[in-house]
């Protein structure tokens, strides 16, 4: 399954939108930094494309879920959020098309499930952090910065997979 070139452009647009969503000066938020334990090893280059597609799908689905809450809607600009949802939705569609084609359905299912679980736990930690910080503006900015970093790392994996073909 070949992800369309528009998928890469969509990923870049997603990062640009995340950058534009910033609402406050980040310099006041230093002390709110937190170690969310991004499972970077689940996005390592050792994975085959068959194994990464469902993990990338889970990552984007979780980002979508995180920013679709009412707390998120209160924190961010509505117009930018709508554009953000649209980009994520398109990327989910691209990845789902690959999953439907049967890529990796029979390959290393346990490894895949472990990776998906690690991604889910990562987002649970993010959600818990936001709750503990009472969804403060700084907490949301820390989360936005974290998502930009983790999304960028997962996007880099997509690019490396494409270049290996």
């Amino acid at each position: 399954c070949d992800l369309p070139q528009t998928h890469s452009l969509g990923s870049r647009r997603t990062l640009m939108l995340l950058a534009q969503m910033r609402r406050i000066s980040l310099f006041s938020c230093l002390k709110d930094r937190h170690d969310f334990g991004f499972p970077q090893e689940e996005f390592g280059n050792q994975f085959q494309k068959a194994e990464t597609i469902p993990v990338l799908h889970e990552m984007i689905q979780q980002i979508f879920n995180l920013f679709s809450t009412k707390d998120s809607s209160a924190a961010w600009d509505e117009t930018l959020l709508d554009k953000f949802y649209t980009e994520l939705y398109q990327q989910l569609n691209d990845l789902e098309a690959c999953v439907i084609q049967g890529v990796g359905v029979t390959e290393t299912p346990l490894m895949k499930e472990d990776s998906i679980l690690a991604v889910r736990k990562y987002f649970q930690r993010i959600t818990l952090y936001l709750k503990e910080k009472k969804y403060s503006p700084c907490a949301w900015e820390v989360v936005r910065a974290e998502i930009m970093r983790s999304f960028s790392l997962s996007t880099n994996l997509q690019e490396s997979l494409r270049s290996k073909e």
Partner: antibody, heavy 121, light 107 residues
């Protein structure tokens, strides 16, 4: 390879203006902040200020607020430190260093080689 | 502003010695504390970040500990290349501040 390359040493007279630079390479320049640190001869490190190159937001130490200006041009991955009117007390080594912003990552993990500024009449 | 106070300001030690440098913050900074090493004519080098995390490429003889207001940098067995000046720095809030430095000299 991550690198921060600073402009060369400067010798200036009191009252003159100056702009020194710090060019980042080997990483996404807008994903990190750039901080500036002063070290006067034989003295310790003093944090001057910082810039977020993604939108040029800045923060200054109260000691340096109004004395210097920090700026950046993300199109050429370069941060700047400038003075409009130098004083003899500005004689020092100036370092730039990158900061991960709000990400949980090492602070000031890469430094420039330093720019020596000498102000003398 | 958060003041950072290092002690001692200088110390003399021999190769193989265990060396401890302390840093105290004027208010709690959680674990937002970094340690740097600087040699004459060179830029500072990050050794420890977030109080106890060893920076990539730094020898394991360097370690950091502490939280809140009191922090320690330990060199378990001093090597010839470790003679330098060491600085702590808080990254809890702006303005960022450094300790005054501790010079480690050869005895």
């Amino acid at each position: 390879e991550v690198q921060l390359v600073q402009s060369g040493a400067e010798v200036k007279k009191p009252g003159e203006s100056l702009k020194i630079s710090c060019k980042g390479s080997g990483y996404s320049f807008t994903s990190y902040w750039i901080g500036w640190v002063r070290q006067m001869p034989g003295k310790g490190l003093e944090w001057m200020g910082i810039i977020d190159p993604s939108d040029s937001d800045t923060a200054y130490s109260p000691s340096f607020q109004g004395q210097v200006t920090i700026s950046a041009d993300k199109s050429i991955s370069t941060a700047y430190l400038q003075w409009s009117s130098l004083k003899a007390s500005d004689t020092a080594m100036y370092y730039c260093a990158r900061h991960p912003g709000l990400n949980w990552a090492p602070d000031f993990d890469y430094w420039g080689q330093g720019t020596l500024v000498t102000v003398s009449s | 502003d958060i003041q950072m106070t290092q002690s001692p300001s200088s110390l003399s030690a021999s190769v193989g010695d265990r060396v401890t440098i302390t840093c105290r913050a004027s208010q709690s900074i959680a674990d937002f504390l970094n340690w740097y090493q600087q040699k004459p004519g060179k830029a500072p080098k990050l050794l420890i970040y977030f109080a106890s995390s060893l920076q990539s490429g730094v020898p394991s003889r360097f370690s950091g500990s502490g939280s809140g207001t009191d922090f320690t940098l330990t060199i378990s067995s001093l090597q010839p290349e470790d003679f330098a000046t060491y600085y702590c720095q808080q990254s809890h809030s702006f303005p960022l501040t450094f300790g005054q430095g501790t010079k480690v000299e050869i005895k």
